[in-house]
């Protein structure tokens, strides 16, 4: 590997470096989709950009592999607990490989939001934020879930969102 | 671009990514004004540092364009949850540039503390923490609110803070 | 310092950067010690691995000095809130140096799950995230500690968890 | 400066209601709580409960929960305070107090004149 | 209820003198290092007045000869040196729970 490779080479880091992985993707309208699969994510409008990741129904798919540090927010609200729907919230980030049929589990929290009315207001808000570094290979995909997800509240792209960078 | 050209700027490159901008703000008596305005910072003391990023007034004012993981953590606490405070509080970063008269929200929490207080104790604790990915240009600003303040605990430094890397 | 030490220092510095230090542990069986001690990881299966800093005794130890954003997460879960457990639970991240004989608090919360609990329902779940970025010195160590750690519950790695990374 | 006017002193019969109203000045009347406490000759302050302008939410003493009505009318920055089935041992001095935090501890940093209630047959 | 405890019921000091006076809470009225405990001044025919809050906290407009003191369950109202109108009725009040409860008062007459 002679000066003029490893030179091209620092060049290729140079401009690789510029364009280090990230993500994040904002809370639509569209998110929820009561169909059990993922929460669906705004890309482009607003704050949300994909940086040398791509998305595809719900996932973020990894182009460069490595170490990322993937996240999620999610805001949780209502008016008590309605019955039939879960007291426990589950909020998790998942990984898709073509090496696996099924999803594997990255990062959950468990929840219980409803306890967080008082006896004044039925009311109640919560949050729930997940984050942490995984290995994911170029092809992989992370997908973002809630149950029960009717619990989970969307406006305007800041109170539930999904992203990630390479570290 | 000829390679003395390159080869500063692969110098200028290395020295400017030793200094990949970076802060850590920590929470300070000073922080809570009751003004209406944002939370206030130490920036210097204890475990504070600013890297590459400066500060003004509570902002954390952006010298390099790019992408930032931008954080904030705050450390809620009351007895009972007294009539006139909010019983929802809203905790926020907030973008402020130029281009626009108002700030901008980035990454919002609405919580329900109070639920927390239980029969046999009316003291509660809550943990608010947001983290995520945005596009800064240089001069933007970036700010914590919390609304209502009066339920933000202050004491070390350990337990509201705000800070901001670049990815 | 001629061209020669300075293509030296470049190609160092691009192996370094391939392995810019990055961990991720996760919560197992043997995590609780009990002993008042700090919470015990996985390093190696599943999700959990180190790269460019090692681990002892439930400590990430730093092998390169510089800022790190350091994170942890645990899930905490119980019946009702029995009498003798703190109906407060601290979470918090400390720092372990040779210069001083005691731990030092980098970033801590408080919460007051049992709260959550609700009229029908006497389980309660509740997570506590911590984030932020700290100047760590080589040989330095950080921890985490939770107090009561009876409330934190284990599964699968997933839920409980404590990672680094350089920025 | 932030000023409380309550009403004039009433007698009333046992029995009967009796509302006092206090009319807020000089301050954002949405922003603070109203609370009331009373005085009985020669004896000591007991707390009445309190009322927050911005919503019209309430917080009362047990002990008058159920007599005591707690009420604020925004369009006049004006509180009040009713008592119902009143008996001779409600004769006092009726105070309104603006409320403040610090923090999430409450403390009572503006007094109106009082109000003195008389029940008497 | 929490039961606010006030020492002595009389007090008898000379001008220029300093007065300690005491309150005692039932059980605690802290949190996070602050405690949820107020003092009041009342002359005859007046409303009580503000002087310190959250135990040491002074009122704005107070004079700094007034000061607050203790924690947890115990608590002090000093007076550094009398003046003739400091002669009134004190005080304290606990805001740590429902209901705010206030101590029987301490009058302070002139020796």
């Known amino acids: 590997d002679g000066p003029a490779g490893s030179w091209e080479q620092l060049i290729q880091e140079r401009r690789s470096h510029e364009v280090n992985p990230a993500a994040h993707l904002t809370g639509a309208n569209s998110s929820l989709t009561g169909s059990g699969g993922p929460l669906l994510w705004e890309t482009q409008l607003g704050l949300a950009f994909l940086r040398g990741l791509s998305y595809h129904d719900g996932a973020l798919v990894v182009t460069k592999a490595g170490y990322y540090y993937i996240y999620s927010k999610v805001q949780l609200g209502g008016v008590g607990c309605p019955l039939g729907l879960a007291s426990t919230i589950t909020h998790g980030l998942y990984k898709r490989t073509p090496r696996y049929p099924e999803e594997l589990e990255l990062l959950v929290s468990q929840q219980s939001p409803c306890g967080r009315a008082t006896s004044s207001s039925r009311v109640w808000w919560d949050s729930s934020f997940l984050g942490g570094v995984v290995h994911l290979e170029a092809g992989e995909e992370v997908v973002v879930r809630v149950l029960d997800e009717r619990l989970v509240r969307l406006r305007d792209g800041t109170r539930s969102y999904f992203g990630a960078f390479m570290v | 671009d000829g390679p003395a050209g390159s080869w500063e700027q692969l110098i200028q490159e290395r020295r400017s990514h030793e200094v990949n901008p970076a802060a850590h703000l920590t929470g300070a008596n000073s922080s809570l004004t009751g003004s209406g305005g944002p939370l206030l910072w130490e920036t210097q003391l204890g475990l504070a540092f600013l890297r590459g990023l400066s500060y003004h007034d509570g902002a954390l004012v952006v010298t390099k364009a790019g992408y930032y993981y931008i954080y904030s953590k705050v450390q809620l606490g009351g007895v009972g949850c007294p009539l006139g405070l909010a019983s929802t509080i809203t905790h926020g970063l907030y973008k402020r540039t130029p281009r626009y008269p108002e700030e901008l929200e980035l990454l919002v929490s609405q919580q329900s503390p109070c639920g927390r207080a239980t029969s046999s104790s009316r003291v509660w604790w809550d943990s608010s923490f947001l983290g995520g990915v945005v596009h800064l240009e240089a001069g933007e600003e970036v700010v914590v609110r919390v609304l209502d303040e009066r339920l933000v605990r202050l004491r070390d430094g350990t337990r509201s803070y705000f800070g901001a890397f670049m990815v | 310092d001629g061209p020669a030490g300075s293509w030296e220092q470049l190609i160092q510095e691009r192996r370094s950067h391939e392995v810019n230090p990055a961990a991720h542990l996760t919560g197992a069986n043997s995590s609780l010690t009990g002993s008042g001690g700090p919470l015990l990881w996985e390093t190696q299966l599943g999700l959990a691995f180190l790269r460019g800093l090692s681990y002892h005794d439930g400590a990430l130890v730093v092998t390169k000095a510089g800022y790190y954003y350091i994170y942890s997460k645990v899930q905490l879960g119980g019946v009702g809130c029995p009498l003798g457990l703190a109906s407060t639970i601290t979470h918090g991240l400390y720092k372990r140096t040779p210069r001083y004989p005691e731990e030092l608090e980098l970033l801590v919360s408080q919460q007051s799950p049992c709260g959550r609990a609700t009229s029908s329902s006497r389980v309660w779940w509740d997570s506590s995230f911590l984030g932020g970025v700290v100047h760590l010195e080589a040989g330095e160590e950080v921890v985490v500690r939770v107090l009561d750690e009876r409330l934190v519950r284990l599964r699968d790695g997933t839920r409980s968890y404590f990672g680094a990374f350089m920025v | 400066q932030v000023q409380l006017v309550q009403s004039g002193a009433e007698v009333k019969k046992p029995g009967a209601s009796v509302k006092v109203s206090c009319k807020a000045s000089?301050?954002?009347?949405?922003?603070?709580?109203v609370h009331w406490v009373r005085q009985a000759p020669g004896q000591g302050l007991e707390w009445i409960g309190a009322?927050?302008?911005?919503?019209?939410?309430?917080s009362y003493n047990q002990k008058f929960k159920g007599r005591a009505t707690l009420t604020a009318d925004k369009s006049t920055s004006t509180a009040y305070m009713e008592l119902s089935s009143l008996r001779s041992e409600d004769t006092a001095v009726y105070y309104c107090?603006?409320?403040?935090?610090?923090?999430?501890?409450?403390?009572?940093?503006?007094w109106g004149q009082g109000t003195l209630v008389t029940v008497s047959s | 209820e929490i039961v606010m405890t006030q020492s002595p019921a009389t007090l008898s000091v000379s001008p220029g003198e300093r007065a300690t006076l005491s309150c005692k809470a039932s059980?605690?009225?802290?949190?996070?290092?602050?405690?949820?405990m107020n003092w009041y001044q009342q002359k005859p025919g007046q409303a009580p007045r503000l002087l310190i809050y959250?135990?040491?906290n002074l009122e704005s407009g107070i004079p700094a000869r007034f000061s607050g003191s203790g924690s947890g369950t115990e608590f002090t109202l000093t007076i550094s040196s009398l003046q003739s109108e400091d002669f009134a009725v004190y005080y304290c009040?606990?805001?740590?729970?429902?209901?705010?409860?206030f101590g029987q008062g301490t009058k302070l007459e002139i020796k």
């Open positions: 000089g301050y954002t009347f949405t922003s603070y709580n």
């Open positions: 059980q605690s009225v802290d949190f996070d290092g602050d405690s949820y």
């Open positions: 107090a603006r409320g403040s935090y610090y923090y999430t501890s409450s403390y009572f940093d503006h």
């Open positions: 009322v927050y302008p911005g919503n019209g939410d309430t």
């Open positions: 959250t135990a040491s």
């Open positions: 009040q606990q805001s740590y729970e429902d209901p705010f409860t």
